[in-house]
């Protein structure tokens, strides 16, 4: 019995659902009562899901698997794995037994996009040409391990004095921290590129350093020029710093964080004490660092509604303030492609191809192209709907007249994360059904 599975690994984003395709060719008169189907982990032989004695025996794998019962009789033994985790990565074997027996293994490759890197400088004040500075590039919650590349403002690679570390959290997702030590020139731009090798996703940030003396007078409050980008559900640090004078004590400090537009109080520190969060109890200062001039705010479990500008007010004897922008983002899922009609397709038929990608933020950019990279812009309708969390589901519909054959590819881009997710469908010239049967 010939059992067919994809040669290439199935790539699935963490948290999304994956289909492990497996098919066989049923003979005339085949009935499900004859079918024994077993999915198991290739290495450990752990049972994942089975179908026997004419019945779905259910999931033996954390209740996250399902078959396609309506398609089994046509030879579709594919397995749906829900809410994919890093730990799911590996090889799954599909065993099919009717009279004869056959099996084949399919690989699941798990992936998660890296966040836009945040850049920090140490020291970050009173920088002069000739000073040695440490630039840290941090990117979060990606999988598998990233590749990190540094370059200057002219594209010259910076490979000396770079130390990169990657730590997996309890979900197996990696946080990457890459540290570059440089001696400052008159000024310079330093850029860090974090690549996800499986998603072929690049996330990059840069920092431009112009060494100079800080002005005297009012308290100089420093915040990042670029928006802080935070993934939905993660924690974000809104950086804010000031330069304490010798003899400074926290009793002198008044620190207020508020929403720039509405002036709503977010968090405060006055009279030598942290006055706590006034913002849904999701904010915190860094109390041990305040005396060194670190007035940064930690915002936990970021939501789409948090996006906007936050102002950091610092008052000691003098007064200063600066605003930092929070840009919220969520990666789009790998698009699913559907055809309508999806059976008996012939050259000359008009088909509607729908590309759907879910739970991203902000709104996506959608691009269609054919198999030669030619953009397809006519007869495209794209709609984006926000759910109650403010995350967008994008549905883009392309109407085409079929040629002899053709590949139609849809690219969904998250403009903030610089994350591209794409799907494609190839339609051959002879009469066919989608998805193709084994």
């Amino acid at each position: 019995l010939e059992v067919q599975v994809p040669e290439d690994p199935v790539v699935a984003l963490v948290g999304t659902d994956a289909t492990l395709c497996c098919s066989f060719s049923p003979e005339p008169g085949f009935s499900l009562a004859q079918l024994n189907l077993i999915w198991q982990l290739t290495d450990t032989k752990q049972l994942v899901h089975s179908f026997a004695e004419g019945q779905d025996q259910g999931s033996a794998y954390a209740n996250r698997t399902a078959l396609f019962p309506d398609l089994l009789a046509q030879g579709n033994a594919s397995l749906r794995l829900q809410r994919v985790r890093v730990a799911d990565e590996g090889s799954f074997t599909c065993f099919v037994s009717i009279r004869d027996f056959g099996s084949a293994a399919v690989s699941l490759q798990v992936a998660a996009p890296y966040s836009k890197p945040s850049m920090t400088l140490e020291p970050n004040k009173d920088l002069r040409p000739g000073d040695t500075v440490t630039i840290t590039c941090s990117s979060y919650q990606g999988y598998p391990e990233a590749e990190v590349f540094w370059q200057d403002g002219q594209g010259v690679p910076l490979t000396g004095n770079v130390t990169t570390s990657q730590m997996a959290n309890e979900q197996g997702l990696f946080d990457v921290h890459s540290i570059l030590r440089v001696v400052l020139g008159a000024n310079g731009t330093y850029s860090c590129l974090v690549r996800n090798p499986v998603l072929q996703q690049d996330a990059h940030s840069s920092v431009t350093i112009t060494p100079q003396r800080s002005p005297t007078g009012a308290v100089e409050v420093q915040v990042p020029e670029d928006p802080v980008v935070a993934l939905v559900g993660t924690d974000a640090t809104l950086r804010c710093s000031f330069s304490p004078e010798p003899g400074f004590s926290l009793a002198q400090l008044n620190l207020i964080w508020q929403l720039t537009d509405t002036k709503q109080l977010v968090h405060s520190f006055t009279e030598g004490r942290d006055q706590g969060s006034a913002y849904a109890n999701r904010t915190a200062l860094f109390p041990d660092l305040l005396a060194q001039g670190n007035a940064s705010l930690r915002l936990q479990r970021v939501r789409v509604a948090d996006e906007g500008s936050f102002t950091c007010f610092v008052s000691i004897r003098d007064f200063g303030s600066a605003a930092v922008s929070l840009q919220v983002a969520a990666p789009y899922s790998k698009p699913s492609m559907t055809l309508e009609p999806n059976k008996d397709l012939r050259p000359g038929d008009t088909v509607t191809i729908t590309c759907s990608s879910y739970r991203g933020y902000p709104e996506a950019e959608v691009f269609w192209q054919d198999g030669q990279g030619v953009p397809l812009t006519g007869n495209v309708t794209t709609s984006q709907m926000a759910n109650e969390q403010g995350l967008f589901d994008v549905h883009s519909v392309l109407r085409v007249v079929l040629g002899a054959n053709g590949t139609y590819s849809c690219l969904v881009r998250n403009p903030v994360l610089q994350q591209d997710a794409h799907g494609s469908v190839t339609i051959t010239g002879q009469p066919m059904t989608f998805p193709p049967e084994a």
Partner: antibody, heavy 121, light 106 residues
Framework: EVQLVQSGAEVKKPGSSVKVSCKAS????????IHWVRQAPGQGLEWMGY????????DYNQKFKDRVTITADKSTSTAYMELSSLRSEDTAVYYC??????????????WGQGTTVTVSS | DIQLTQSPSFLSASVGDRVTITCRAS?????MNWYQQKPGKAPKLLIY???NLASGVPSRFSGSGSGTEFTLTISSLQPEDFATYYC?????????FGQGTKLEIK
């Protein structure tokens, strides 16, 4: 129009030096690095080194490090490549090229017309 | 040094053929650029940052890849495409080119 115009062909004796110029026009000379790439007859492209005309930072391919010097004159928007201790295997076409783009993607978008250097006794 | 190895080194093809040239890097690189060179001329940029078409380059050219393996594809060869093609990286010093792939008319 962005252009790099190189000096004319040179015939040199083994052991001598050659200095090839590359004049830039149509863009801000100090905004991009200028690289030198050579190509021996019937062979592929070989990178020699670059200069940042603004900072005058240079870096060279180790293969040429002791023999090549790249300089730039901001006042005339001209880059120079000097190769010393010439030998017959240095016979090649020498190109200057602008490394262009923006963070983090860069590429050679403008090339000089090439300068043929022949080393022969 | 990161070595770039192009395959094949020589390729004979006909007008209308689909052609793929591969460039393998000895270590992972951040991206790849591709150039076309005709006899007696300077190289010309075709593809930058692995998959982006340079200005004025026909859409029959495309690039793909990641890490250590990159490809340049010409979907339907035209007479003017017969030339030598080079890949190039500068993720670490020195900047390197592939040895070239000469595309000839069959």
């Amino acid at each position: 129009e962005v252009q790099l115009v190189q000096s004319g062909a040179e015939v040199k004796k083994p052991g001598s030096s050659v200095k090839v110029s590359c004049k830039a026009s149509g863009y801000s000379f100090t905004s991009y690095t200028i690289h030198w790439v050579r190509q021996a007859p019937g062979q592929g492209l070989e990178w020699m080194g670059y200069i940042n005309p603004n900072s005058r930072n240079t870096d060279y391919n180790q293969k040429f490090k002791d023999r090549v010097t790249i300089t730039a004159d901001k006042s005339t928007s001209t880059a120079y490549m000097e190769l010393s201790s010439l030998r017959s295997e240095d016979t090649a076409v020498y190109y200057c090229a602008r490394y262009s783009g923006s963070t983090p993607y860069w590429y050679f978008d403008v090339w000089g017309q090439g300068t043929t250097v022949t080393v022969s006794s | 040094d990161i070595q770039l190895t192009q395959s094949p080194s020589f390729l004979s093809a006909s007008v209308g053929d689909r052609v793929t040239i591969t460039c393998r890097a000895s270590s992972s690189v951040s991206y790849m650029n591709w150039y076309q060179q005709k006899p007696g001329k300077a190289p010309k940029l075709l593809i930058y940052a692995t998959s982006n078409l340079a200005s004025g380059v026909p859409s029959r050219f495309s690039g793909s890849g990641s890490g250590t393996e990159f490809t340049l594809t010409i979907s339907s060869l035209q007479p003017e495409d017969f030339a030598t093609y080079y890949c190039q990286q500068w993720s670490s010093n020195p900047l390197t080119f592939g040895q070239g792939t000469k595309l000839e008319i069959k």
